[in-house]
């Protein structure tokens, strides 16, 4: 007896699609061996139509695919545009066609719906709209028009032209009589329910000369689309419910038990706590379609999801819906990375972001998830040299360590930096990942002066004190710019005296700027790293002023200026190019922003073209605001 199992009989109609699932024991060998779908010939052979190794017969070109789901021990054969010629006996199997590892499937394709005994067949999805057309003759033009539903042996009036509406259809049905030129009336039923299915009779007139027309309404449940995504990755549900619900509240829910469908997110502002920080409901198009992105997929996210439209923002009878069955693949290609990174106020975090290593040339992005309204994720930094204005001097995206990981460093942390951040690229959208930054109590490990003023033409020495815990780390100074942080020569001045209970392994490493020029103004970072992996950083703003008295400046921790806490707004806003991200609306800034902090966002033009003084000055004034 073959261990392969599937549907013995499949019945469908012309023009339709079938999706045939075949089950196999998920042993290591079976998972990776060839899967096939073949048609049995009269003389016993079985001719391959499609296989997992890429072969597709000309008979199936452009209308069939075979997908293997190794975790579950299943493979699925999808065949579209069925014709009666597709009727026959098939096998789904593993290995070689002639071997016994197969299962027999009978496919029967019957004639498509049409006029059967003068009955018009209407096949419509649950929640959608149907228009039943009813022709009549001139002599019945002025007479009563009506639609009946056959319930058992009896016709029950549904609607008529005198204004009657059956209570089961209240608020979702209308009868339209076309202009005088057309001898036709229509009945439009919205928000179709499964119970609406059945035989209908439309009638013009009430006597023996009345015109009658039969209609068969079939209401289909939406078949969940199978979606198979990697653990820690991302999924996008595209929901197209039709223009008739363009102005109705939209929702995505997850089925729990029975008819319960727990709202995951809706356009009325509801969001399930389990999805906080990792979900966005995309702005909807004029046609009512929208999409929902969920990142940082977890094992428990697997399940059946429905999207729909209803004024309540949740599933109700008659909601037009679309369905998905999400499977989360635990043999993920997306590497583990911390989902929570903790940083001390005043210090820094270094976040490692995974990306598809096949896409090393893709543009890398980092954005801050905002929960307001339906969620959005405005960009903060990218790998092409753009940094949101309020983050100048304290945020850097580095291509290191490379080979599938980039690094984002954020320093000068405040409690306002706590939140969810997304790592993404303009390549594979499945590789969007989420990290939560938490701000904790404590003291920064690196000690640097506050903001420093250098004198033109003089020498400036800026100290950075490293505690002994960093003795094995490489210590560096660099100058921040919007493409990264360029390393600078520094001097090890021996043990630091800035730490209590710290032995000779503590270090004072100084940055020396000789013959200071205007170009030296800006942000400088000292930090630690191990190879290409970055640790803590500390930032110092160096301002440059005219000479007052001769000599060099050696800045100590005590002499440091406090950074002024002023708000300076930049005009303009950041718009993401279409080429950069597949759906730019997910990340584009909105022009109307309630909080002035969000308006302090320079456009790319102002960042690229401004002089170093302008950039430095503006950074200096509002680096605390974001």
């Amino acid at each position: 007896k073959s261990p392969i199992f599937g549907p013995e009989e499949v019945n469908s109609v012309e023009g339709n699609s079938v999706s045939i699932t075949c089950y196999y024991p998920p042993t290591s060998v079976n998972r990776h061996t060839r899967k096939y779908w073949c048609r049995q010939g009269a003389r016993g052979g079985c001719i391959t139509l499609i296989s997992s190794e890429g072969y597709v017969s000309s008979k199936y070109a452009g209308r069939a695919n075979l997908t293997n789901f190794p975790e579950n021990g299943t493979f699925v054969v999808n065949i579209a545009q069925l014709s009666q010629d597709d009727s026959g006996r098939y096998k789904c199997g593993l290995g070689i066609n002639s071997r016994g590892l197969s299962f027999d499937v009978s496919l029967e394709v019957s004639q498509g719906p049409g006029l059967l005994n003068d009955t018009k067949v209407y096949t419509v999805d649950l929640g959608r709209t149907v228009t039943i057309n009813c022709p009549f003759k001139t002599e019945n033009a002025q007479k009563r028009k009506s639609l009946y539903k056959q319930i058992g042996l009896y016709p029950v009036l549904v609607i008529d032209s005198s204004g009657y509406v059956n209570p089961n259809y209240t608020g979702r049905i209308r009868l339209d009589i076309q202009g005088t030129g057309q001898l036709l009336f229509s009945v439009v039923i919205n928000q179709l329910r499964l119970s609406d299915a059945g035989q209908y009779l439309c009638q013009a007139g009430d006597d023996s000369n009345s015109n009658k027309k039969n209609a068969d309404l079939q209401v289909l449940k939406p078949e969940p689309e199978l979606v198979y995504e990697d653990l820690r990755g991302s999924v996008t549900f595209h929901c197209a419910l039709g223009p008739e619900v363009a102005n109705v509240a939209k929702f995505l829910c997850r089925q729990s038990s029975g008819e319960n469908c727990d709202v995951v997110v809706n356009t009325l502002g509801k969001r399930a706590p389990a999805f906080e920080g990792r979900i966005l409901l995309n702005p909807q198009d004029k046609d009512g379609s929208f999409s929902v992105v969920i990142t940082g997929l977890r094992k428990e996210d697997a399940g059946r999801y429905l999207c729909g439209a209803h004024s309540d923002g949740q599933l109700q009878e008659g909601s037009p819906i679309q369905a998905w069955q999400l499977f989360v693949n635990e043999e993920s290609t997306i590497p583990r990375s911390p989902t929570v990174v903790k940083g001390v106020a005043g210090s820094s975090v270094a976040v490692l972001c995974p990306y598809n290593r096949k896409e090393s040339k893709s543009i890398k992005y980092w954005c801050l998830w905002e929960g307001a309204q339906n969620g959005r994720c405005p960009l903060l930094v990218d790998s092409e040299g753009w940094v949101k204005a309020q983050y100048e001097g304290r945020l850097s995206l580095l291509e290191e360590p490379g080979n599938g990981t980039f690094t984002v460093i954020l320093n000068q942390l405040t409690s306002r930096d706590a939140g969810f951040y997304w790592c993404l690229t303009n390549g594979d959208t499945l590789w969007r990942t989420t990290v939560e930054i938490k701000i904790i109590e404590g003291e920064p490990n690196l000690k640097v002066p506050g903001n420093v003023t250098a004198v033109l033409g003089e020498t400036l020495k800026v100290p950075c004190h490293f505690p002994c815990k960093f003795s094995s780390y490489e210590k560096y100074w660099c100058k921040w710019n919007n493409t990264g942080c360029q390393a600078l020569p520094s001097q090890d001045e021996g043990p630091s005296k800035a730490f209590v209970n710290c032995d000779e392994n503590s270090r004072l490493v100084s940055l020396t700027l000789n013959l200071v020029t205007r170009a030296d103004e800006g942000w400088y970072w000292c930090g630690v790293k191990q190879g290409h992996f970055y640790g803590e950083t500390a930032a110092v703003y160096v301002a440059v002023e005219e000479r007052k008295a001769a000599g060099s400046r050696d800045v100590s921790l005590a002499k440091a200026d406090a950074a002024p806490d002023e708000k300076v707004l930049d005009s303009g806003f950041r718009e993401i190019e279409n080429k950069a991200i597949q759906d730019p609306r997910l990340f584009a800034e909105e022009k109307a922003v309630a909080d002035t902090r969000d308006q302090a966002d320079g456009s790319r033009a102002s960042v690229d073209s401004g002089s170093s003084e302008e950039q430095g000055g503006s950074s200096r004034h509002h680096h605390h605001h974001h």
Epitope: P113, L220, K221
Partner: nanobody, 127 residues
């Protein structure tokens, strides 16, 4: 609350026929799979047959021991399920359970893959 209610069980002679029915009024909108299992005294629950709907397509699955003798049918919109049993044998004696809404990725033949169950109806085939 989802309730699956079986009917049609009884006592018949070998080679007779019997038709079982199942109604599942509370099933979720998107449920599109229903099936039959049976359990004889002292034995594990065994897969009998299942039916799935997708759009205008219908998929029928059968257990090895009933192929060619039993026919599964149903109405997706009404959440009803029938099992026409012909050529009954004494070894078909069991409690027959209606099941609904399996895990999309589970093997339909395993009872653990199904979410909802009826209370069962007894079928006894005497020789």
């Amino acid at each position: 609350e989802v309730q699956l209610v079986e009917s049609g069980g009884g006592v018949v002679q070998a080679e007779d026929s019997l038709r079982l029915s199942c109604a599942a009024p509370g099933l979720p909108f998107s449920s599109s799979r229903m099936g039959w299992f049976r359990q004889a005294p002292g034995k594990e629950r065994e897969f009998v047959a299942a039916i799935g709907w997708s759009g205008r397509s219908t998929y029928r699955y059968y257990g090895d021991s009933v192929k060619g003798r039993f026919t599964v049918s149903g109405d997706n919109a009404k959440n009803t399920l029938d099992l026409q049993m012909k050529g009954l044998k004494p070894e078909d004696t069991a409690v027959y359970y209606c099941a609904a809404d399996p895990d999309y990725y589970g093997d339909y033949r395993t009872s653990g893959a199904w979410r909802y169950w009826g209370q069962g109806t007894q079928v006894t085939v005497s020789s």
